[in-house]
């Protein structure tokens, strides 16, 4: 058993049927000594009495807000969360696993450059009852600060027959160089706290490896005269690193028929600019990566050939 | 520790090419390691990121472009510094600044060099025979120096008398390509800088 | 005590279907992820499918993936493996297990997969 | 496609120690804990170690596990001719949890 917050204690469970559970022993915050009687949640069962009380902890039945009175007066409150252990390894129900990069991935994380700002997200299909609370450090063993803000419902979605909630915090660390070589990754927790059920993830990265740029920005068309080639023209997106010719991006144009089925054409370059032929119907677009590590792809900045 | 806009140097063209070439190879290199490796913890995720020229060199610093020297984070990220007195930046010379930067790189590069020559010689000795250095990579270390054209008194090749333990020689080579393909991407954004001035 | 009883196993021909059961009792079923384990004659265990305590995610081995259906009822504190399109490769004596460091197995039921 | 691999058979005498080893990777046995269970003819498995190296109350104390790395192993200390079996090592792999992975299975023979 451990302190999660103030009069909050997490009881660690190895889960499966008939298990022996944990002897937990509650104590009453009071100078009090005799009179004391003990209950759970809203019940007026009387579980015992004494200035500690030893329950058994199996089941979410025995967890729950554990009071002390004396004398119709509430003496002090615990409450009792579970974390289950299964199999050792401890349950991931609270969040959808996005399987994306790879399996197994409850928290993602995206910075729009290499501030040492980065924002992550996580999905569920729980809509009550739900609480979040986030951390950062930049190492484990001797953790340099990030400072995260609260976690916050950003979207819901609907998937077949299930609402889906996106959750998600903006971290910044305390102290960044954007030219800096990261040697130590980022490591961000997630405590997450469904009714009585507690369960924690963690994220671990290079700023470097998260990095996804904002689209570019005023995208243009100029005709070039008596050709069927247009003239394409972007600028760096606002939010990323400058200098620009020291974080430099590279870019991808793409020509793309009304069609999905039609024939896409792509150039890559790094310049600013681009020529290519403008189809009747087509889009132009856009989408620019760090031009020397190769992390993600922006979205598509697009505009209509005609 | 900073790099202020400098006329165009005719000479850093070169060195632009070249250092694009070495981030190609480098990453080659380490996606090949990665492949043939799979079974030894290789990745990004699994490996220990040591930095072979911390305390020697002082790259990031010495190269950090003029418009980051305002940012307090990119001045003390290191003990080590070409620069100390930060107020006497406005009256060192454009050139004196850049020299530091590049003989940095210099010695990062023959730093890597010496390692990589001696890693070879032990995979070679692999009765395995599993993975060993990709040529072009070292010729493109070596090409990338003689453009910096910094005289420096050779490094010996380290030698070992001890039987190589080629489980340890293969971890340490994925983790000195990590850290080289790191450097080669700031050597890239110092080379593209430089360029742009 | 835990107790898991199976029942539904038989003999069938290719491409029809089965269902299996798996009744539990002694515990707090719906507290549980269950999974079911075959064992083809003479071979060794291979794990077929899981469910989650409360059905919201499922899980399948890549050869059953499409034909077999894990669900669960847990207000009848019952397992089920609905298989479909059967093949002559699903014939095994097919377990029911508890999710967790120590588990309790079903006596198993013989499916039998032959024209 | 068994990621988990165990020989075959092992045999030994009344009263010798005998070990069966399981060799996996780094995504499953390198990162999860492993199981052993022992299984007689027509009967279903029965758990004899969880979390590498537990014993379940009832399970006779000859029996023992290990983990090391990306492989780990049961020792019988003293076989006795009821333990004439096929074994199984289990574990996770990292990807794809809950998914059980199976050993190959060793059958165990006690001569004499």
């Known amino acids: 058993i451990w302190e999660l917050k103030k009069d909050v204690y997490v009881v660690e469970l190895d889960w499966y049927p008939d298990a022996p559970g944990e002897m937990v022993v509650l104590t009453c915050d009071t100078p009090e000594e005799d009179g004391i009687t003990w209950t759970l949640d809203q019940s007026s069962e009387v579980l015992g009495s004494g200035k500690t009380l030893t329950i058994q902890v199996k089941e979410f039945g025995d967890a729950g807000q554990y009071t002390c009175h004396k004398g119709g007066e509430v003496l002090s409150h615990s409450l009792l969360l579970l974390h289950k252990k299964e199999d050792g390894i401890w349950s991931t129900d609270i969040l959808k696993d996005q399987k994306e990069p790879k399996n197994k991935t409850f928290l993602r994380c995206e910075a729009k450059n290499y501030s040492g700002r980065f924002t992550c997200w996580w999905l569920t299909t729980i809509s009550t009852d739900l609480t979040f609370s986030v951390k950062s450090s930049r190492g484990s063993s001797d953790p340099q600060g990030v400072t995260c803000g609260a976690a916050t419902l950003s979207a819901e979605r609907v998937r077949g027959d299930n609402k889906e909630y996106e959750y998600s915090v903006e971290c910044q660390e305390d102290s960044a160089c954007p030219a800096a070589e990261e040697s130590l990754p980022i490591e961000v927790m997630v405590d997450a706290v469904h009714k009585l059920k507690y369960e924690n993830y963690t994220s671990s990265f290079f700023i470097r490896d998260i990095i996804k740029p904002d689209p570019p920005k005023n995208l243009q068309l100029k005709p070039l005269k008596n050709s069927r080639q247009v003239e394409v023209s972007w600028e760096y997106p606002d939010t990323w690193s400058t200098p620009h010719s020291y974080f430099s991006l590279t870019f991808c144009v793409q020509v793309q028929g009304k069609s999905k089925r039609e024939k896409k054409d792509r150039v890559f370059t790094d310049k600013t600019s681009a020529t290519v032929i403008c189809r009747k119907n087509a889009s132009i677009s856009v989408r620019a990566q760090d031009r020397y590590y190769s992390s993600s792809w922006s979205e598509w900045a697009s505009v209509p050939c005609s | 520790r900073n790099l202020p806009v400098a006329t165009p140097d005719p000479g850093m063209f070169p060195c632009l090419h070249h250092s694009q070439n070495l981030l190609r190879a480098v990453s080659n290199m380490l996606q090949k390691a990665r492949q043939t490796l799979e079974f030894y913890p290789c990745t990004s995720e699994e490996i220990d990121h040591e930095d072979i020229t911390k305390d020697k060199t002082s790259t990031v610093e010495a190269c950090l472009p003029l418009e980051l020297t305002k940012n307090e984070s990119c001045l003390n990220s290191r003990e080590t510094s070409f620069i100390t007195n930060g107020s006497c930046l406005a009256s060192r010379k454009t050139s004196f600044m850049m020299a530091l930067c590049l003989s940095s790189i210099y010695e990062d590069l023959k730093m890597y060099q010496v390692e990589f020559k001696t890693m070879n010689a032990k995979l070679l000795m692999d009765p395995k025979r599993q993975i060993f250095l990709d040529q072009n990579m070292l010729a493109v270390i070596d090409e990338l120096m003689q453009a910096l054209n910094f005289n420096s008194e050779t490094v010996p090749q380290k030698s070992s008398l001890e039987e190589p333990d080629f489980y340890k020689t293969k971890i340490k080579l994925c983790i000195l390509l990590h850290a080289f393909r790191i450097r080669a991407v700031t050597i890239d954004r110092v080379m593209s800088y430089l360029n742009a001035s | 005590q835990v107790q898991l009883v199976q029942s539904g196993g038989g003999v069938v021909q290719p491409g029809r279907s089965l269902r299996l059961s798996c009744a539990a009792s002694g515990f707090t079923f719906s507290s549980y992820g269950m999974h079911w384990v075959r064992q083809a004659p003479g071979k060794g265990l291979e794990w077929v499918a899981f469910i989650r305590y409360d059905g919201s995610n499922k899980y399948y081995a890549d050869s059953v993936k499409g034909r077999f259906t894990i669900s669960r009822d847990n207000s009848k504190n019952t397992l089920y493996l609905q298989m479909k399109s059967l093949r002559a490769e699903d014939t095994a004596v097919y377990y029911c297990k508890t999710h967790g460091s120590h588990d309790n197995w079903g006596q198993g039921t013989m499916v039998t997969v032959s024209s | 496609s068994y990621v988990l691999t165990q020989p075959p058979s092992v045999s030994g005498t009344p009263g010798q120690r005998v070990t069966i080893s399981c060799s996996g990777g780094?995504?499953?046995?390198?990162?999860?804990?492993v199981k052993w269970y022992q299984q007689l003819p027509g009967t279903a498995p029965k758990l004899l170690i969880y979390?590498?190296?537990s014993r379940p109350s009832g399970v006779p104390d000859r029996f023992s596990g290990s983990k090391s790395g990306t492989s780990a192993s049961l020792a019988i200390t003293g076989v006795q001719a009821e333990d004439e079996a096929d074994y199984y090592c289990?574990?996770?792999?990292?990807?794809?949890?809950?998914?059980?992975?199976f050993g190959t299975g060793t059958k165990v023979t006690v001569l004499g």
């Open positions: 289990q574990s996770y792999d990292r990807g794809t949890h809950p998914a059980l992975l």
């Open positions: 780094r995504s499953n046995i390198g990162s999860n804990t």
């Open positions: 979390g590498n190296d």
